[in-house]
């Protein structure tokens, strides 16, 4: 006869591990007892259990409540046991010693591998600001046994660096993603992908990039100066900029206070029917937590009568 077992039994943390030990004997052979022991402890062999043809299953105190026989139907030649709720400390070498009649004793050894799936965490780096050099965008850490694989999935251009820390029964892997911040990266996903044999599928943690910036400010509304004449209604100036965080707008007049009747509505400055009083230098002040920008324009409200008089003068001068 001979013993049938596995070289390696692999289970995920918390699962039950079946430790196989089956005696493939000739007809008429009987198994008297099967002794299971853990054999990689420093002091000596640590008995798990004894399966006795007469006394049944006897579990040693250290494994009480954790070792069982597989559910029926049971073959009397099967010395396999179940180790319930495998923990990381169970990883190691085990042997079964089988006493048979009349063939004598047999022994087999196996390695129990307990996979500890990682619980990854993603930590964003410092605030990203346009104009910085190479900056940490995020780091992703996963600890497990064996060491997990940590990679990045993103459209953003950057560089990665990984380091690993070995512990007694596991390894922690940290991967960092560095980039040169630019406004085009804003709102882009940066996904940490963790692979491990104990996971049914890769674990993914997504971080949305936020890059602080503030675009140059400009003012729209003065494209056609001829429209800015006395009496015109609905005249307005619009301040153009963009930023992250979204900027706030403030309007001032450089050569005095804003004229009465002028309405400030965020990025827009709305005028009542134009008068010459509205002529002046207007400043749009754009700011966010990252920066501030100014843009100024000169409004010159035209008097059509003056213009026509001038034209007459010009004509008469000719």
């Amino acid at each position: 006869g001979e013993l049938e077992t596995s070289d390696v039994v692999t289970v995920v943390l918390g699962q039950d591990a079946k430790l196989p030990c089956f005696y493939r004997g000739d007809s008429g052979e009987q198994v008297g007892q099967v002794a299971w022991a853990r054999v990689d402890a420093g002091e000596g062999a640590q008995e798990l259990a004894l399966l006795h043809s007469k006394y049944g299953l006897h579990v040693s105190p250290a494994y009480e409540g954790r070792v069982e026989q597989p559910p029926p139907p049971r073959n009397p030649l099967d010395g396999s046991v179940l180790l319930r709720n495998a923990v990381q400390a169970d990883e190691g070498e085990y042997e079964c010693r089988v006493s048979t009649f009349p063939a004598g004793s047999f022994q087999a050894r196996l390695r129990l591998r307990v996979l500890v799936p990682p619980l990854p965490s993603l930590n964003p780096g410092p605030a990203l600001e346009e104009g910085q050099g190479l900056t940490l965008a995020a780091s992703c850490t996963a600890e497990g046994s064996p060491a997990p694989s940590v990679t990045w999935d993103t459209e953003v251009k950057g560089t990665t660096s990984s380091r690993s820390f070995k512990h007694s029964r596991s390894a922690a892997v940290t991967s960092e993603f560095h980039l040169v911040p630019s406004r085009s990266m804003n709102g882009q996903p940066l996904t940490c992908v963790v692979s491990h044999p104990g996971l049914l599928q890769d674990q993914r943690i997504t971080h949305i990039l936020h890059v602080s910036f503030l675009a140059e400010a400009s003012v729209r509304g003065l494209e056609d100066q001829n429209l800015w004449h006395i009496g015109r209604e609905g005249a307005m100036l619009k301040c153009l900029s963009e930023g992250q965080p979204p900027p706030s707008y403030n309007w001032t007049r450089l050569d005095g206070p804003l004229p009465s009747g002028v309405r400030v509505d965020g990025d827009t400055l709305g005028f009542p029917p134009l008068t010459t009083e509205h002529s002046g230098i207007y400043v749009c002040h754009v700011s966010n937590e990252f920066s501030s920008r100014d843009s100024q324009v000169t409004v010159d409200v035209l008097d059509p009568q003056e213009d026509s008089g001038k034209q007459v003068d010009l004509v008469s001068a000719s």
Partner: antibody, heavy 120, light 111 residues
Framework: EVQLQQSGPELVKPGASVKISCKTS????????IHWVKQNHGKSLEWIGR????????IHNQNFMGKATLTVDKSSSTAYMELRSLTSEDSAVCYC?????????????WGQGTLVTVSA | DIVMTQSPTSLVVSLGQRATISCRAS??????????MHWYQQKPGQPPKLLIK???NLESGVPARFSGSGSGTDFTLNIHPVEEEDTATYYC?????????FGGGTKLEIK
Amino acid sequence: EVQLQQSGPELVKPGASVKISCKTSGYTFTEYTIHWVKQNHGKSLEWIGRINPKNGDIIHNQNFMGKATLTVDKSSSTAYMELRSLTSEDSAVCYCARSGYGSSYGFAYWGQGTLVTVSA
Amino acid sequence: DIVMTQSPTSLVVSLGQRATISCRASQSVTTPRYSYMHWYQQKPGQPPKLLIKYASNLESGVPARFSGSGSGTDFTLNIHPVEEEDTATYYCQHSWEIPYTFGGGTKLEIK
């Protein structure tokens, strides 16, 4: 310090029973199997059986089935062995024993022994 | 049951010399990791004392002049150099299966 303290010598008549004790200290009683070993005068050692104090499971040497009954009292961390239907062949020193730390095999700790004398 | 046969049954060794005691099991008691064989010393009126576990591992507190060797079925206990206090009976024991059995003992005398 691990200690196994056995009860004193017993002089019993043939056919009677005797119950000897093994009081343990210095460790958690339920974490180690207690073994019993017999030694006839001037002779070798014979393993009687073992008991798991955690659940009371017993495995006997077939030679002692019906002769030795093993029990424990967890509250006092004490193991007991009762020998019944005694004959002169049962006169012996009986030991309780325990394995060492980190190993289930080899008896690192022993009681001092209890001499059982069966005589009319 | 596994039968343990010890030899010699008695042994006289001069102080400072080597004492060699043999033990043979009726079947192998060795796996790739361990030999399930242990040696004990017993002095009159005392319980046995574990000297060597797993064929060759010296028990804590036991003098280094005691050593064990062997695998499979044949095992040896060596004491060198012997001292007066080593006068005792020595037993081998297997823990391969139930029942655990002991050898018949070897009585060592120092002259």
